[in-house]
């Protein structure tokens, strides 16, 4: 079938990085500058994406693959293929539709994106608060209150561990 198709359609022989040029008797021509074809048999090449303004180039366009963009410092990607850049906030803040705003008491954000998350309620798992939460950090839960009876050895608060971070885009 593939052989039959290639006999009927000479364009199917054109590899990625070329296009089937109808103006030149269906000869395979290289993609012009700033364009690409990622699959064979294409009749046109696609225009390369340009990473301008708040977007910056993560991967240059080649004859066989589109450019890939990410965001300049102070912004982060949203959408498939980083279709949008959204401004970062500081840790301890969340981005609302009216801009960055501090986390309310009882919530925190240790990222530069997303919204403020409620502090862990240590008592739900029968534990006590070892280190209080802040706008930037969750509480640290310690042993259950029963474990902290008089005479029990004191517990040294651990250094805050790295909280879950960003997904790679």
């Amino acid at each position: 079938f593939e052989r039959t198709r290639s006999l009927q359609d000479p364009c199917s022989n054109c590899p990625a990085g070329t296009f089937c040029d109808n103006n030149r008797n269906q000869i395979c021509s290289p993609c012009p500058p700033n364009s690409f074809s990622s699959a064979g048999g294409q009749r046109t090449c696609d225009i390369c994406r340009q990473c301008k303004g708040v977007f910056r180039t993560r991967k240059e366009c080649s004859s066989t693959s589109n450019a890939e963009c990410d965001c300049t410092p102070g912004f982060h990607c949203l959408g498939a293929g980083c279709s949008m850049c959204e401004q970062d906030c500081k840790q301890g803040q969340e981005l609302t539709k009216k801009g960055c705003k501090d986390c309310c008491f009882g919530t925190f954000n240790d990222q530069k994106r997303g919204i403020c998350r409620p502090w862990t309620n240590c008592s739900l798992d029968g534990k006590s608060v070892l280190v209080n939460g802040t706008k930037e950090r969750d509480v640290v839960c310690g042993p259950s209150p029963a474990d902290l009876s008089p005479g029990a050895s004191s517990v040294t608060p651990p250094a805050p561990a790295r909280e879950p971070g960003h997904s790679p885009q």
């Epitope: 309310c104 839960c141 879950p164």
Partner: antibody, heavy 120, light 109 residues
Framework: QVQLVQSGAEVKKPGASVKVSCKAS????????MHWVRQAPGQGLEWMGW????????NYAQKFQGRVTMTRDTSISTAYMELSRLRSDDTAVYYC?????????????WGQGTLVTVSS | SYVLTQPPSVSVAPGETARITCGGD??????VHWYQKKPDQAPVLVVY???YRPSGIPERISGSNSGNTATLTLSRVEAGDEADYYC????????????FGGGTQLIIL
Amino acid sequence: QVQLVQSGAEVKKPGASVKVSCKASGYTFTGYYMHWVRQAPGQGLEWMGWINPNSGGTNYAQKFQGRVTMTRDTSISTAYMELSRLRSDDTAVYYCAREPGYYGSGLDYWGQGTLVTVSS
Amino acid sequence: SYVLTQPPSVSVAPGETARITCGGDDIGDKRVHWYQKKPDQAPVLVVYEDRYRPSGIPERISGSNSGNTATLTLSRVEAGDEADYYCQVWDSSSDHPGVFGGGTQLIIL
């Protein structure tokens, strides 16, 4: 690639407990919060809670507080959800789902689900 | 706690446009996520943070959110789009941070 693989179906009697596991692969387990969501037959999705696999910190929906416990074993990249004092209306498919690295976005990867049937 | 209201079902002919709504008080101030749920399959995130599509989700699926209503739009609907669709938000101010709508069954005529 990211995968969340859950334990198999369970049949339990009312009053018993069930513990469902969710094994993560393809990413750094401690880097992403894990959520649990259930769907009872003919019903919608219901959020149960989350666990921070890094610290073990949890947050449970009030409806489940006192009956649910979420834990993790970082050595085997596995999260657990235990539900106690089971009732017939706890019959549902239970899903684990990964948060994408920051709070406030959608849950980007889901386990295949574990059917828990509560019947006398 | 916060309540999200969805119509139980929406019917549409193949090739037409389906619009599924999700109502909530000042929902425009929140970030809304949409999931597609087919029988015996896990939910799939199709739109996040009001209007962004994860990789692999077709461009004919889009979202919007303002005022008291968020909307998921599926254009050029196909038979494979038949499923339940759920909206979801995070509400940090309540004792139930994860909130789902009741779900909408999309019926392809």
